[in-house]
């Protein structure tokens, strides 16, 4: 998930502030950006949110709020200043007309601008099943933990408070930012109004149906009774729930998004700022049968995407459409004929669809996770998701072929036990958006902020890449691939890991230039071997096959063409031990895979020879897939002999600290 | 139809700076990688710098901390900064954009840059 | 970095005559070269690419031929319109991306 991404209108406006005589003019050459949504009929011009740089206070906020106003005026223009934005964002919300917006972009302290847009619910008029492990049956289903040390905040329609299901777990706050319902001859009818929401509070939490039984929830009304909100009312809601954390700090805090609008840097912008804080935000993938990056909340890589599947473990179709997928989605959960709380009666249920329930699952999930480990980081919580859930269960047939490698197949699931997980070694694959086909084309893959890059890879469907190189940016190491001339663009392909105390670094070998082909080890003490990368100039590397893989007695080294430079990624952390496994294959074949054993992870993914058959290298799960072009078009056999070299790792260190816990 | 104008060249004294441009119109820049490509009189050409459709610049160890390239979107146009100009920067610079499966595909008819005392 | 070299210098030919053109990169550039035409006071026109793939609206009697170092550009009869500088230019090791220093065509 990237915030890069998305299919997503950007409008740049390169402005001087030169008229009025601004005491406090952009420096020269800076340009604020104006953004709306890529999807017109979900536009809403005339209100813009106005982002301003990070470190402005808020009387800076009200003093430019104030001074578009004043220049408005001068033009004859009236504005209405909606909500000043302090705590997650510094900004402000306001009503104008579009003619201002060369005016409101010269402004001091601007960063960008975004027209305001629709967001809607994500649900469609078996589950515990599911997700429940092997040893629980579903009509059994009693949680360890039910989720008590957690609090829920659900930002949604309005709720049926007093349901049987949901009474005394769901406390309505009273906040409300919703738009006008559209239509003249709308009824408000308040079991319609209240449907999507008590639902979905019914999922997470209710006494019967729902995931974490124990679980405490708090209701924010951001959908109107068409299931309709907007961008800047989801904004204050969320800045509502940084307020109310900072006032009265309590257990950890889950926020449910089950909505989703099109691609939005300021909502993306948000939910970072709020994951930052701590708070684990889990929302719907989106029901558009479509990439989920196109969309926001769902495309924010802090947020845990959630697309749908049913009880046979497909992709749930919805009319037409159907769940979302793609590199921005992290799992899947039940999604289809859910049954949960209906607001028609204190007592009635309903069966609904969509990423909105899968979404409510996971958050339940989530909370049940979170209570029995309540100092569980975000990003130790999204890889433990990850890791219990049932792997490579969905047909992936049903997604468009070009999603098929980068949509995780994954459902979510309980963990068997809600301790004794510490000792393993958690990573996951974290694809980049796709780089576009010119030369230069580069594609970044990121880790989260307290995850480690353990490793590198690329891959490409036209097999033309110039490899992949692990360097620094902005003092964390990120994945950067390579396109080639006349490629279709690459894919950078990082592999995040969970190492406490690591300490990694980079070493590279330059082109070798020799037969022998172009090796490098880790030569510190103590650093282990935990991935490889290549990265060639040339457009085209000639076929070379080294005499020798690996010396035996030197594991700790990559090894590669002669043209390319290959990088090591070289880790220290205590008890961590890296083994390299290799599975070659003579004869010419689409894919090769080696598996790490049970007890080791993947932590790198290569293949060998780096020559331009090879279309690239990924990890799924753990295990390592080498693709290669068509048989039927590679040439001599000895041209399609592939290897692919898995790193499988595990910390001894790891594994004694929850000994000792137990 | 694609074209590219260049503009800002002159003449300039050794040790000075010069801005040239180079306004695109029949395509968007960004989805490009674009070069500056140079021609001193009677001479061969040499390629100058390229920024590819992702941002990253490239330049030859002859300008490499004299010449920065850049692009504005917006304006659909590709600069080329010039400092510390020296004698041997004389030429006529091109803009040239580069097809995503053809080199050089479509080159601006050049901007003279004249560097003496 | 590669260093492409041209010869002839200069290549004189009678109007319809064919033409034979020679570029050689110091190291193999695969099939990732250029040519390209460049009349006086024009910019370059981009002529061959892949070493063999002709441009779009560039007439039958431009060829290349050649892969790794040595390539040709053969000119089958040579109109007036072809008289000019042809420079080949290596793509595939870069930065830099490099040129020859250029045939020059002219009437015999």
């Known amino acids: 998930q990237e915030d890069e991404d998305g299919d997503y209108e950007e409008l740049v406006l390169a402005l001087r502030s030169e008229e009025d005589g601004l005491a406090e003019a952009p420096e020269h050459g800076t340009t604020a950006t104006f953004h709306r949504c890529a999807k017109d009929p979900w536009r809403l011009p005339g209100t813009y949110v106005v982002v301003l740089k990070e470190e402005t206070h808020l009387s800076q906020s009200e003093r430019t709020a104030r001074r578009l106003q004043a220049q408005a005026a001068r033009r004859g223009y009236l504005t209405k200043i909606l909500h000043v934005f302090h705590g997650l964002l510094p900004g402000f919300l306001v009503k104008m007309s579009g003619d201002l917006l060369e005016l409101a972009l010269k402004l001091p302290h601007v960063d960008y601008i975004e027209e305001d847009s629709s967001v809607f619910a994500q649900s469609i008029p078996w589950n515990l099943e599911r997700i429940t492990p092997p040893r629980y049956r579903a009509d059994e289903y009693q949680p360890p933990d039910g989720g008590s040390l957690v609090e829920v905040y659900l930002l949604d329609t309005s709720i049926q408070s007093d349901h049987r299901e949901i009474e005394g777990r769901v406390m309505v706050t009273d906040f409300e930012n919703v738009p006008e319902e559209d239509g003249t001859r709308f009824h408000r009818q308040a079991s319609k109004c209240d449907s999507h929401g008590t639902h979905l509070a019914g999922v997470v939490s209710g006494r019967d149906a729902g995931v974490a039984k124990g679980a405490s929830m708090r209701s924010l009304r951001v959908l109107n009774c068409q299931g309709k909100g907007t961008v800047s009312g989801t904004l204050i809601g969320l800045e509502f729930i940084r307020k109310s954390q900072l006032v009265q700090p309590v257990g950890p805090l889950v926020v449910l998004l089950p909505l989703a609008g099109g691609y939005s840097r300021v909502l993306n912008a948000a939910c970072q700022r709020l994951a930052r804080a701590g708070v684990v935000l889990v929302t719907a993938a989106g029901n558009f049968r479509d990439d989920a990056c196109l969309y926001s909340p769902a495309s924010a890589p802090e947020v845990i995407t959630v697309g749908a599947t049913n009880a046979q473990d497909q992709p749930v179709t919805l009319g037409t459409l159907g769940t979302n997928f793609g590199r921005c989605v992290d799992l899947f959960a039940p999604g289809e004929d859910i049954i949960g709380a209906s607001s028609d009666c204190s007592t009635c249920f309903v069966s609904q669809s969509g990423t909105s329930q899968a979404a409510a699952h996971v958050a339940g999930i989530a909370a049940m996770m979170l209570s029995a480990e309540p100092e569980l980081t975000l990003a130790e919580l999204r890889q433990r998701l990850i890791h219990f859930s049932a792997k490579d269960v969905i047909n992936e047939a049903w997604f468009p072929e070009d999603q098929r490698v980068l949509t995780p197949n994954l459902v979510a699931a309980l963990p068997p036990s809600t301790h004794g997980a510490g000792w393993q070694l958690f990573c996951r694959t974290v694809w980049s958006a796709h780089s576009g086909p010119t030369r230069m084309a580069t594609a970044v893959a990121r880790c989260a902020p307290d995850e480690e890059l353990l490793s590198c890879s690329s891959f490409s469907r036209s097999g033309k890449r110039r490899g992949e190189r692990m360097e620094a940016q902005g003092g964390k190491l990120v994945c950067r691939a390579h396109n080639a001339f006349g490629g279709e663009g690459v894919y950078a392909i990082a592999r995040c890991c969970l190492l406490p105390q690591a300490n990694c670094s980079v070493h590279t070998a330059p082109p070798a230039e020799a037969s022998m082909g172009t090796r490098v080890h880790c030569h510190q003490q103590g650093h282990v071997l935990t991935g490889c990368s290549s990265h060639w100039e040339v457009e085209d590397l000639g076929t070379h096959k080294p005499p020798v893989l690996r010396p035996r007695g030197q594991p700790n080294q990559c090894v590669g063409h002669r043209e390319a430079s290959i990088h090591a990624s070289c880790c220290h952390a205590p008890g961590l031990e890296c083994k390299v496994k290799e599975h070659g294959i003579p004869a010419p074949q689409e894919q090769v895979t080696v598996a790490c054993e049970e007890g080791w992870t993947l932590t790198g993914c290569s293949a060998l020879p780096g020559t331009s058959h090879v279309l690239g290298a990924y990890a799924v799960d753990n295990t390592c897939v080498v693709r290669s072009r068509d048989v039927s078009t590679t040439g001599s056999t000895s041209e399609g002999a592939v290897t692919a070299v898995a790193i499988c790792c595990r910390s001894r260190h790891l594994a004694q600290a929850s000994q000792e816990l137990q | 139809e694609v074209q590219l104008v260049e503009s800002g060249g002159g003449l300039v004294q050794p040790g000075g700076s010069l801005r040239l441009s180079c306004a695109a119109s029949g395509f968007t820049l960004s989805s490009y990688d674009m070069h500056w490509v140079r021609q001193a009189t009677g001479k061969g050409l040499e390629w100058v710098s390229a920024i590819g459709s992702t941002g990253d610049t490239y330049y030859p160890g002859s300008v490499k901390g004299r010449f920065t390239i850049s692009r504005e979107n917006a304006k659909n146009s590709l600069y080329l900064q010039m400092n510390s100009l020296r004698a041997g920067d004389t030429a006529v610079y091109y803009c040239?954009?580069?097809?995503?499966?053809?080199?050089?595909?479509?080159w601006g008819q050049g901007t003279l840059v004249t560097v003496s005392s | 970095e590669i260093v492409m070299t041209q010869s002839p210098a200069t290549l004189s030919v009678s109007p319809g005559e064919r033409a034979t053109l020679s570029c050689r990169a110091s190291q193999s550039v695969s099939s990732n070269l250029a040519w390209y035409q460049q009349k006086p006071g024009q910019a370059p026109r981009l002529l061959i690419y892949g070493a063999s793939t002709r441009a779009t609206g560039i007439p039958a009697r431009f060829s290349g031929s050649g892969s790794g170092t040595e390539f040709t550009l053969t000119i089958s009869s040579l109109q007036s319109e072809d008289f000019a500088v042809y420079y080949c230019?290596?793509?595939?090791?870069?930065?830099?991306?490099?040129f020859g220093p250029g045939t020059k065509v002219d009437i015999k």
């Open positions: 230019q290596q793509y595939n090791n870069w930065p830099p991306f490099t």
């Open positions: 040239v954009r580069e097809g995503w499966e053809v080199p050089f595909d479509y």
